[in-house]
């Protein structure tokens, strides 16, 4: 015999106590499949959480972080301060990147200059706090006399944290 | 030499999902960025998003977050790229790319992979 | 996002002709600009990278050149195999972002 519940759609749910019926999920709540006993709970934006997509009746509210603020784990669980390009976020707040290390974005952590010579290449632009450096051709391919290394590119707004 | 090498070809229904792989051989897979780009048909080049495998951070474009997820695997050297919820207008060559010696452009190119959404 | 504005998107040219392409981000990006070859099979390269470096094995007819937000990929002397289509990239903000494209055939 078929189960009667699974004619149920998406945003309602099989109420036993009304014999089975599929009745609306509740207000505050959803049901994203078809075939529910139950209707789930939406999730709240509160406090350092902002909405970012409303709670229907199938489908569950999505947050975000209010601003000054970045996402972590998975459907944006927690929230985390954002530091300045050149910096990490760290127990006691956010620090200045170290010297041979930079971070061009609002968060994420101080990563390593490229080391262009691993690659066969020379330095073409020097390394920030907030830049990486830009490798260039392998030395071999400067001509003599040319200057290889470029003064580094004033920072703005991120790439991403290369190498 | 670098090489970059993906998946083959795949068709796939809407709504179904598809995972894309990349696969890096000649250089240290830990040490360059693999970036995604979406070419749709007739279309120019669209940036999807990177990830450093050598911690798995990941950059995403706005425009891509609820749609792909970029993973790696440090073991086999590969990346990966997984839609979901497919729909017609995910039909497009995905290309994975290395990046360059921190200059952000892409020095490395797999030969693209051909997905098409179709009922 | 950074706004990549291409042109021309087309251009055909004889063998020999001196070919330019410009490519204008919506704002600064210092010299953070790329440029790619598309070939009809769907190959890409990258040719110069960092506004005006060419890249190890790129002919030298390529040249590129700019700041800012206004630069310029030059072909010095068409040549047959040049029939691509070019791209430019900004590479200083995230998502990066592609020019539309300029497609290139040979008169």
């Known amino acids: 015999l078929q189960d009667p519940c699974s004619n149920c759609p998406a945003g309602t749910f099989c109420d036993n106590n009304r014999n089975q019926i599929c009745s609306p999920c509740p207000p505050n709540s959803f049901s994203s499949a078809g075939g529910q006993r139950t209707c789930d709970i939406c999730r709240q934006c509160k406090g350092v959480f902002r909405t970012r997509k409303e709670c229907s009746s199938t489908s569950n509210a999505e947050c975000d972080c209010t601003p000054g603020f970045h996402c972590l784990g998975a459907g944006c669980s927690m929230c985390e301060q954002d530091c300045k390009q050149g910096q990490e976020l760290t127990k006691k707040g956010c620090k200045d990147c170290c010297f041979g290390t930079f971070n061009d974005q609002k968060r994420g952590i101080c990563r390593p200059w490229t080391n262009c010579s691993l690659d066969g290449k020379s330095v073409l632009v020097n390394g920030t706090k907030e830049r990486d450096v830009v490798c260039g051709p392998s030395p071999a391919d400067l001509s003599p006399g040319a200057s290889s290394v470029t003064p580094p590119a004033p920072a703005r707004e991120p790439g991403h944290s290369p190498q | 030499q670098v090489q970059l090498v993906q998946s083959g070809a795949e068709v796939k229904k809407p709504g179904a999902s598809v995972k894309v792989s990349c696969k890096a051989s000649g250089y240290t897979f830990t040490s360059y960025w693999i970036n995604w780009v979406k070419q749709a048909p007739g279309q120019g080049l669209e940036w999807i998003g990177n990830?450093?495998?050598?911690?798995?951070?990941?950059n995403y474009n706005q425009k891509f977050k609820d749609k792909a997820t970029i993973t790696a695997d440090k073991s086999t050297s590969t990346a990966y790229m997984e839609l979901s919820s497919l729909r017609s207008e995910d039909t497009a060559v995905y290309y994975c790319?290395?990046?360059?010696?921190?200059?952000?452009?892409?020095?490395?190119w797999g030969q693209g992979t051909t997905v098409t959404v179709s009922s | 996002d950074i706004q990549m504005t291409q042109s021309p998107s087309s251009l055909s040219a004889s063998v020999g002709d001196r070919v330019t392409i410009t490519c204008r981000p919506s704002?600064?990006?210092?010299?953070?600009l790329n440029w790619y070859q598309q070939k009809p099979g769907g190959t890409v390269k990258l040719l110069i990278y960092y506004t005006s470096r060419l890249r190890s094995g790129v002919p030298s007819r390529f040249s590129g050149s700019g700041s800012g937000t206004d630069f310029t990929f030059t072909i010095s002397s068409l040549q047959p195999e040049d029939i691509a289509t070019y791209f430019c990239?900004?590479?200083?903000?995230?998502?990066?972002?592609f020019g539309q494209g300029t497609k290139l055939e040979i008169k």
């Open positions: 704002q600064d990006i210092s010299n953070y």
């Open positions: 990239q900004q590479g200083d903000t995230l998502p990066y972002t």
């Open positions: 790319t290395r990046d360059y010696g921190s200059s952000y452009s892409f020095d490395y």
């Open positions: 990830i450093y495998p050598s911690d798995s951070y990941t």
